[in-house]
């Protein structure tokens, strides 16, 4: 029997009947065995076929076999109902070998020319399967020359049989208090040859409850308990299962916080699997009852381990744990069924006793000592000497625990000193220097610091004075000893004030005239205003109408008297304003340099002399009564004058304060 070529030789060629293309002889039998490489098959087709036709090709025939299977028995020239001729058909081996047998019987009624066939090896596409046949691979099939291989979708691994895809379904741990788990691909059929392990692991104190839901379909057997595929449920206490078949198992109350679910499948079957919805329970905590004026959130039918609630108080109430205020409150249910924190109280917000108002007082409006939410208090300033600044003084205890004004301010109102109050009323006529009485010049300040000088209190922490009086102390403000509230220069009964800073007008040049002879002293503390210590007012825009020529101003101080000594008692003198040109002319003569009197100065005194301020009065205020407001204001600051105080034809020269209002206001607002 001739053999065809064998692999690894090239596998292709031609076969023909004996004597072809001539007629074949009788009683011929010829056999060819063709072999292709593994993973290949043989393809065969006929280019000529002319054999004796007989019933079921019993006489002459060509038989094609592959292994034990006969692929075809061929005869004749064309196919009939019972006989087959190859025609244009192509024949394929089932494996890698093909047997071809030619036989002719003892006679032919007429001559037949036989057959001619060609063959070749070709790759088998193992991935193509006939309908109804099992697929080559579980998931993905990849053909290649001489073979194929299988691969799996994500989440699966190729079984050692190289065809089946086993699910990677172990090691999943569920830690939430409830959830769902199911067989792989549920509700589609679950994978074969898989072993799945799922863990539910909750905190100690919880008990897992398993409910099988929707459908249950696991391969079973009528006689043996789950021999193929099965589901098992294991806790630290007991094992449940195995489960299989089509009936939903009953709820399982595990009484355990840890559960292991095992699902094992074999190589066959087509079942949809299972789905479990799990929940958990624990010992419930006592139902939280909200404190008065508070509410619980969230509201639940019951609260178990790890459940929590918060308490929120109504507006105007605050959380208190004992006596300690809390920003927030959340309690958590513990495994023993108790809450981790005791219930707080919602206590009405208490703003506490209101702060004392410097130079003022506070009155309880709602009730004596009532400082709780919505309580009202009224601040007021000490009458006569203080007035409240831009505020009605009414404060309400708000929900944030702060006393709040009607304008929403949380800061205290400000009691501003009333300025320009004096026990003295001006008489208008001029008379000699005389002793001041208590309360006449409550703004009068005695400044000691190398020399004796004066100043005037502004507000409750500033002193207005002359630049030349404090020039030497401008860099050592603390060296200034500032006294007020006394008439006697040598009395120990004064109010002591200390300088924090000295501000000398930038236009003042020491020892080069007295232009811009003005300075401010900032005190390091506010002084208490009373009948003996009261600030002087600054001039209003309209003040010049009270400071015309011949209008009376009053100068006060402890400066030199006619006897040539510093006065023991505060003295004052009423003097008229002098025409500016007249004053300028008086100081044009030597020894005074030209231009000594500037537009920033005003002059006051008698042409006849005798009434004047003198050394030691420097920095003190020349004051005027504003007849509209009935308050005294500072029009001038004692600055300079003739060498001999009170000299006829010479006048006291004062810094014109109205020219410096912006400077004063800027300094005070900035510092």
């Amino acid at each position: 029997t001739p053999l065809g070529p064998k692999w690894p030789e090239p596998v292709f060629g031609r076969l023909a009947s004996p004597g072809f293309p001539g007629e074949y002889a009788n009683d011929q039998e010829r056999r060819w065995t063709l072999t292709a490489p593994p993973g290949y098959r043989l393809r065969l087709y006929f280019t000529h076929f002319d054999l004796e036709l007989s019933h079921l090709c019993e006489y002459d025939f060509v038989k094609l076999s592959s292994g034990a299977k006969v692929l075809a028995t061929l005869c004749g020239q064309e196919s009939t109902d019972t006989e087959r001729a190859p025609g244009k058909d192509t024949f394929y081996s089932l494996g890698s070998s093909l047997d071809i047998t030619f036989r002719s019987d003892y006679s032919n009624e007429k001559p037949f020319t036989g057959f001619e066939a060609f063959y070749a090896a070709e790759d088998i596409d193992e991935c193509q399967v006939a309908p109804g046949e099992a697929p080559t691979c579980d998931h993905h099939c990849h053909n290649h020359l001489g073979g194929f291989y299988c691969s799996c979708r994500a989440g699966y691994v190729l079984h050692r049989n190289k065809r089946t895809c086993s699910a990677l379904c172990s090691g999943q741990v569920f830690t939430q208090r409830s959830g769902e788990l199911s067989s792989p691909e549920y509700p589609r059929p679950y994978p074969k040859l898989s072993s799945c392990t799922y863990s539910i692991s909750l905190e100690e104190g919880f008990s897992v409850i398993l409910d099988f839901v929707e459908s249950f379909d696991v391969e079973t057997h009528p006689e043996t308990l789950c021999p193929y595929d099965f589901l098992k449920i294991q806790t630290d206490r007991e094992e449940h299962g195995p489960f299989c078949g089509k009936t939903l198992p009953h709820r399982i109350e595990t009484k355990s916080n840890t559960v292991t679910i095992t699902f094992v499948t074999d190589e066959s079957g087509d079942h949809t699997g299972w789905k479990i919805h799990y929940t958990s329970t624990a010992q419930p905590c006592p139902y939280p009852m909200a404190p008065p004026n508070g509410h619980v959130s969230p509201v639940q039918a019951k609260y178990i381990l790890k459940d929590s609630f918060s308490i929120f108080c109504e507006t105007g109430y605050e959380l208190l744990q004992g006596h300690l205020p809390l920003k927030s409150f959340t309690a958590v249910c513990q495994k023993d069924g108790s809450w981790d924190r005791p219930m707080p109280a919602c206590s009405i917000v208490d703003c506490g006793p209101p702060d004392d108002l410097p130079s003022g007082r506070v009155e309880y409006i709602t009730g004596p000592g009532v400082t709780t939410y919505k309580a009202v208090i009224q601040y007021s300033c000490e009458e006569t000497f203080y007035t409240m600044k831009v505020n009605d003084g009414k404060y309400v205890c708000e929900a944030d625990g702060f006393w709040t004004s009607s304008k929403g301010e949380k800061s205290l109102p400000v009691c501003e000193p009333v300025c320009g109050l004096s026990a003295r009323t001006t008489g208008g006529r001029i008379y000699g220097g005389q002793k001041a009485k208590p309360g006449d010049f409550p703004w009068q300040v005695l400044i000691l610091g190398g020399t004796t000088a004066a100043g005037a209190l502004l507000y409750d922490n500033w002193v207005l004075t002359a630049a030349h009086a404090v020039y030497e102390q401008k860099h050592d403000a603390s060296a200034l000893d500032i006294r007020m509230g006394t008439l006697k220069r040598l009395s120990p009964h004064y109010t002591q004030a200390w300088s924090e800073a000295v501000f000398i007008h930038e236009g003042y040049t020491h020892d080069a005239g007295f232009d811009n002879d003005i300075a401010l002293i900032k005190l390091n503390n506010k002084v208490v205003i009373n009948s003996n210590i009261t600030p002087i007012c600054l001039p209003r825009k309209e003040a010049e109408s009270f400071m015309r020529t011949d209008d009376i101003g009053t100068a006060s101080g402890w400066g030199l008297t006619q006897r040539g000594f510093l006065a023991r008692n505060l003295m004052y003198v009423d003097i008229p304003i002098v025409d500016h040109q007249k004053c300028t002319a008086a100081y044009e003569k030597p020894p005074y340099p030209r231009g000594s009197v500037t537009a920033n100065m005003l002059c006051a005194g008698l042409e006849s002399g005798g009434k004047d301020s003198c050394r030691g009065d420097s920095g003190g205020a020349l004051v005027f009564l504003d007849s509209e407001t009935e308050r005294w204001f500072v029009g001038g600051i004692v600055s300079w004058g003739s060498m001999n105080c009170g000299e006829a034809g010479q006048y006291g020269v004062y810094t014109k304060v109205i020219n410096y209002i912006p400077w004063i206001e800027n300094i005070i607002s900035d510092f």
């Epitope: 000893d481 006697k488 040598l490 009395s491 120990p492 009964h493 004064y494 002591q496 200390w498 023991r568």
Partner: antibody
Framework: QVQLVQSGAEVKKPGASVKVSCKAS????????MHWLRQAPGQGLEWIGD????????HYIEKFKDRATLTIDKSSSTAYMELSSLRSEDTAVYYC??????????????WGQGTLVTVSS | DIQLTQSPSSLSASVGDRVTITCSAS?????MYWYQQKPGKAPKLLIY???NLASGVPSRFSGSGSGTDNTLTISSLQPEDFATYYC?????????FGQGTKVEIK
Amino acid sequence: QVQLVQSGAEVKKPGASVKVSCKASGYTFTNYWMHWLRQAPGQGLEWIGDIDASDSETHYIEKFKDRATLTIDKSSSTAYMELSSLRSEDTAVYYCARGDITTTLRYFDVWGQGTLVTVSS
Amino acid sequence: DIQLTQSPSSLSASVGDRVTITCSASSSVRYMYWYQQKPGKAPKLLIYDTSNLASGVPSRFSGSGSGTDNTLTISSLQPEDFATYYCQQWSSYPLTFGQGTKVEIK
């Protein structure tokens, strides 16, 4: 030299009054304030009040406002302190002291020798 | 009223020792004054305006401090310095004294 000489020791019954004198010399009496202080046995110093020798302006601490009276006799340069409604706790050495007039005016540069006042029934 | 607290209340020291007495005020004071008192005698001014030595007072005495804390220092204690020392303030009415510090011979 500047000195203050006080009157001698006194023994008084409770409810009585005592008047202690303090004669100044060696300075201009009316230029200064005179202060009065006391010291109970084994105790510290306590200020009572003061008087301006020039015009008799007085100041007392609250405790002594109703019982102490400070006066001046310019002609003899003498200051007086009278304490009424005496009680046993008023037993003390009473001092007059001159107030400084050079700096703060708030301390005592010259002291009398002290007068012991004993209040006992 | 401003309270003045002296410390120590008493101390024992030897001739030549350096002695420091402190006076603590309940509120800030601008100036402190110090007096020395010997048994049966009137007090005598030592220091005025915190740090100035009164007339006739030996230079071994010195004062310092500010605010609420003031100190009297005797740099080298002499036999005649054994006495009681008082601080005094009048920054705030009424004037007040400390309770005294007794310096005794060791």
